[in-house]
């Protein structure tokens, strides 16, 4: 007979997270981003799939499209025309790459409650959008662009040279979609819909990556993608603009490329309309340390676009590449010539600058040993932006308002003190003229979305507070999280540590390092997540750490550009340094340390395992890069230069995982990759495996047939179950 144990009743009902919880998405959260249609109105899809219009000022709501209409064509998405006469309904969604997909589109006429018949849209369409005013339609079908003046009208074909895998009009090719724009579209309406600008990408000379897609046919299909790897031939881009009122009159007019850009290989990086007759294009040299912003004007007399040299603004980096991950985009002010833009100041921190005539005469708007991250909106009297200034935590995001109408400009943090414990990482979405805005808080507490008055910043209402999630978590023993920093040799290493619920500093715990570590990334963020590593801490008693080392973002150029032309060195060193510091803290079992990462993180975890330090017992690489010669030109060359003898070939060769095959002998290595990875090709893992076999080094591997870089669907469950078994075995944890 055993005496009944006395428990704290609350403790007794608490349970640890299970792997099933994670795989089922039991503790996922919701955000609320209004689909703004005016200064005071927005659309939102209700829980029962009606499309509802909300008027903030009156507090009234209206169903503009019933779930019955949505269901009649199996619509999964919608778009209201700006004149509110039509809605496009999107169905048969078929994913292509990261952003791109094809779909079938139906146009519903709100004035008669019927679908538009006659001159229906072809299928499947690659991209479709309304003009910003009225109800003109632009769409891309079979790599060509079409225009409709009204939904029921016959289409006007703008381009004729579109060809699969050869010429792309109005949509990007693979590398522009993933690494440059990064969007599924490459066409842009002018503010009132007078003109339509578009990009043409010529991929005729780009080498093709080919891989098998096994499907369930007798013979596998071969997927072919024009994909420029480092040093290979790149797409050739041209920008055209057409008058949409009289499209046949002069046809598409090409926008000239700045001479200093056109002299060698180059990229187009973005297009921003300023007015209906002024457009701003950004260009980038293939060696991505020089960017040119070019402001072009419509010449009525010639019906052409003129880009005077006096309206060219050069942005150059002498210590790294231009910009952060991408070159920032300008936000124009009401005078339609001056603009605000984020770039490095003289101290090497990314800040907002105001450019009126030349970049040299730019007026710095923000400054400090922190970074401005995004400009959300510029109005007549205010500029709204996000930064990580508050309390000097680089992994936070707060929204600020600078008054630009008064002198000196005054700065106010809109979000810093709203829900201080719960919310330290915000983004925002503004209505026309910033009359109202939504704040979306991602953590560290449970995410919450709120609506605010754009003049007073007063909270109007809660849009989504994740009450169900809050209730569901009440009986869950979540791990503890802490964000702190290590100071090592004049480098600040911020880290996030996820600790078991009953963490005791006097005990020893196995340590798992989760790493990404790619240039201009950030892993240590004050955001809410209940994910696989939460489960590993909660149920399996592991300590998990994430470390932002050299090459990571939002802490100044010194840290960011430290990895320039030298990928695979300092990122790895800094993970190792952090692990040594964690061991010194006294609660880590130094015989049970593992590292894992995905994509760039798989590259870093592989190199860390092969570093010869003896620190790591085991590790996992999911879809890793193994040699920079195998990855996309746009991304790789930004950070590494070219793989040529007279440039940086030597480091391309030195930084491969294969070169370190011998060093995997004393670690347990699990290598995982999807065979249909269009991004980091299976080739990367195939070459690691070959090198390990040739070196007679034992390792474990798992491939996922026909899965891409995301390893989604059923593969996700298998993947995390498999990795869990591997880690538990490595750490001698019972199943």
């Amino acid at each position: 007979l055993r005496p009944s144990r006395v428990h704290n009743s609350e403790e007794n009902t608490m349970r640890a997270l299970t792997l099933k919880d994670i795989l089922n998405g039991t503790f996922s959260y919701k955000t609320f981003f209004p689909n703004w249609i005016s200064g005071q109105e927005y659309l939102h899809q209700s829980a029962d799939n009606n499309i509802v219009l909300y008027n903030i000022e009156t507090g009234q709501s209206y169903t503009i499209l019933s779930n019955r209409t949505m269901k009649s064509v199996n619509a999964s998405n919608y778009g209201l025309s700006p004149d509110r006469q039509f809605v496009y309904l999107e169905s048969d969604y078929s994913k292509l790459w990261r952003y791109s997909y094809t779909a079938t589109y139906y146009i519903y006429d709100l004035s008669n409650g019927e679908f538009v018949r006659g001159n229906e849209l072809p299928r499947p369409i690659q991209y479709l959008c309304w003009s910003p005013v009225g109800s003109k339609l632009a769409y891309v079908y079979q790599n060509n662009i079409y225009l409709k003046q009204r939904p029921g009208d016959p289409p006007f074909q703008i381009t004729f040279n579109g060809r699969e895998n050869k010429i792309f009009n109005g949509i990007p090719d693979w590398v522009y979609e993933e690494e440059m724009l990064p969007t599924k579209y490459a066409l842009w309406w002018s503010p009132n819909g007078k003109f339509l600008a578009y990009a043409e990408f010529n991929d005729k000379d780009i080498p093709v990556i080919a891989y098998s897609y096994y499907g369930d046919e007798q013979y596998p299909r071969t997927i072919n993608i024009p994909y420029p790897k480092a040093g290979a031939k790149n797409p050739v881009v041209r920008i055209f603009i057409i008058d949409t009122t009289y499209p046949a009159y002069v046809g598409p007019q090409e926008v000239p490329v700045p001479a200093m850009i056109a002299s060698s290989d180059y990229y187009f990086s973005w297009l921003t309309w300023v007015t209906d007759e002024r457009v701003c294009l950004q260009w980038l040299k293939r060696v991505q340390n020089v960017s040119v912003l070019s402001i072009c004007d419509f010449r009525e007399d010639w019906q052409t676009w003129d880009c005077p040299k006096t309206q060219e603004h050069i942005e150059e980096s002498r210590t790294g590449w231009a910009g952060g991950f991408f070159v920032s985009r300008p936000v124009f002010s009401y005078d339609a010539i001056s603009y605000y833009k984020i770039f490095s100041d003289k101290d090497g921190y990314k800040h907002i600058h105001y450019i009126k005539d030349t970049v040299e005469n730019a007026i710095q708007i923000t400054s400090g040993k922190w970074e401005a991250i995004n400009i959300f909106r510029v109005t007549q009297d205010s500029l709204f932006y996000s930064s990580n200034e508050f309390e000097e935590y680089p992994g936070r995001r707060n929204i600020y308002r600078i008054s630009i109408g008064s002198y000196p400009p005054s700065k106010k943090c809109v979000t810093c003190h709203l829900r201080k414990e719960r919310c330290q990482y915000y983004t925002a979405s503004f209505s026309d003229y910033a009359k109202y805005y939504a704040l979306v808080c991602y953590g560290p507490g449970i995410p919450i979305s709120t609506l605010h008055d754009g003049r007073t910043d007063q909270e109007i209402k809660i849009l989504e507070e994740n009450k169900e999630l809050e209730n569901a978590l009440k009986n869950i023993q979540l791990p503890k999280e802490e964000i702190k920093k290590l100071e090592v040799d004049e480098i600040t290493l911020w880290y996030k540590m996820i600790l078991p619920p009953q963490f005791d500093r006097s005990k020893k715990y196995p340590l798992l390092i989760q790493v990404y570590g790619g240039p201009c990334s950030q892993s240590v963020r004050s955001v809410f997540a209940v994910n696989w590593i939460s489960y590993l801490a909660s149920k399996e008693g592991m300590v998990i750490a994430l470390v932002d080392g050299r090459g990571t973002a939002f802490q100044g150029d010194k840290l960011l550009y430290a990895v320039y032309r030298k990928l695979g060195v300092y990122e790895v060193e800094d993970q190792i340094t952090a692990v040594r510091k964690f061991i010194e803290m006294g609660f880590i079992d130094e015989k049970r340390i593992a590292i894992w990462g995905w994509s760039y993180g798989g590259y870093v975890s592989s190199l860390a395992l092969a570093s010869g330090t003896g620190l790591f017992k085991c590790g996992i690489a999911v879809a890793p890069v193994s040699s920079w010669e195998y990855y996309a030109s746009v991304y790789t060359e930004r950070f590494m230069g070219l793989p040529t003898k007279d440039d940086n070939l030597e480091h391309y060769k030195n930084s491969t995982v294969m070169a370190r095959a011998e060093y995997f002998r004393n670690v347990d290595y699990l290598l995982i990759h999807g065979t249909a990875d269009d991004n980091v090709h299976f080739q990367n893992s195939a070459q690691i495996a070959k090198a390990l076999v040739n070196a007679q080094v034992d390792f474990q591997a798992m491939w996922y047939s026909d899965q891409n870089h995301g390893l989604s669907g059923l593969s996700t469950n298998h993947l995390y179950t498999h990795m869990t078994h591997f880690l538990k075995q490595c750490f001698s944890l019972s199943d």
Epitope: S38, E41, N55, D83, R84, D109, S111
Partner: nanobody, 123 residues
């Protein structure tokens, strides 16, 4: 140019009914979207119901199932049948017109207005 004239307002008990009418002048009445707005003291003018040129109706969720908008093109008239009235329905009711879509809920988007008719619902 469209001229609008409302009628039919008055005092009614809670749960009672009223029918508002709006007579429009202008030959192209049929091509206009028509709307009924209301304004209670100290509050914004709000769209209660709208009807498109094609006869498609939309309602504020607060009145859906109680109010019905309709139009008689031959008589250039638009109606608002209000049933199960509540004290909070008390307001000045305005008839409005615009060319184009009916799914505009802000007064600034409706260029043509009547003078308004008072509806008072007593408890």
């Amino acid at each position: 140019q469209v001229q609008l004239q409302e009628s039919g307002g008055g005092l009614v008990q809670a749960e009672g009914s009223l029918r508002l009418s709006c007579a429009a002048s202008g030959r192209t009445f049929g091509s206009y979207a028509m709307g009924w707005f209301r304004q209670a003291p100290g509050k914004e003018r709000e769209l209660v119901a709208g009807i498109s040129s094609g006869g498609i109706t939309n309602y504020a969720h607060s009145v859906k199932g109680r109010f019905t908008i309709s139009r008689d093109i031959d008589k250039n008239t638009v109606f608002l049948q209000m049933n199960s009235l509540k004290p909070e329905d008390t307001a000045v009711y305005y008839c409005a017109a615009r060319s184009g879509g009916a799914y505009y809920t802000s007064r600034v988007d409706w260029p043509y207005w009547g003078q308004g008719t008072q509806v008072t619902v007593s408890s």
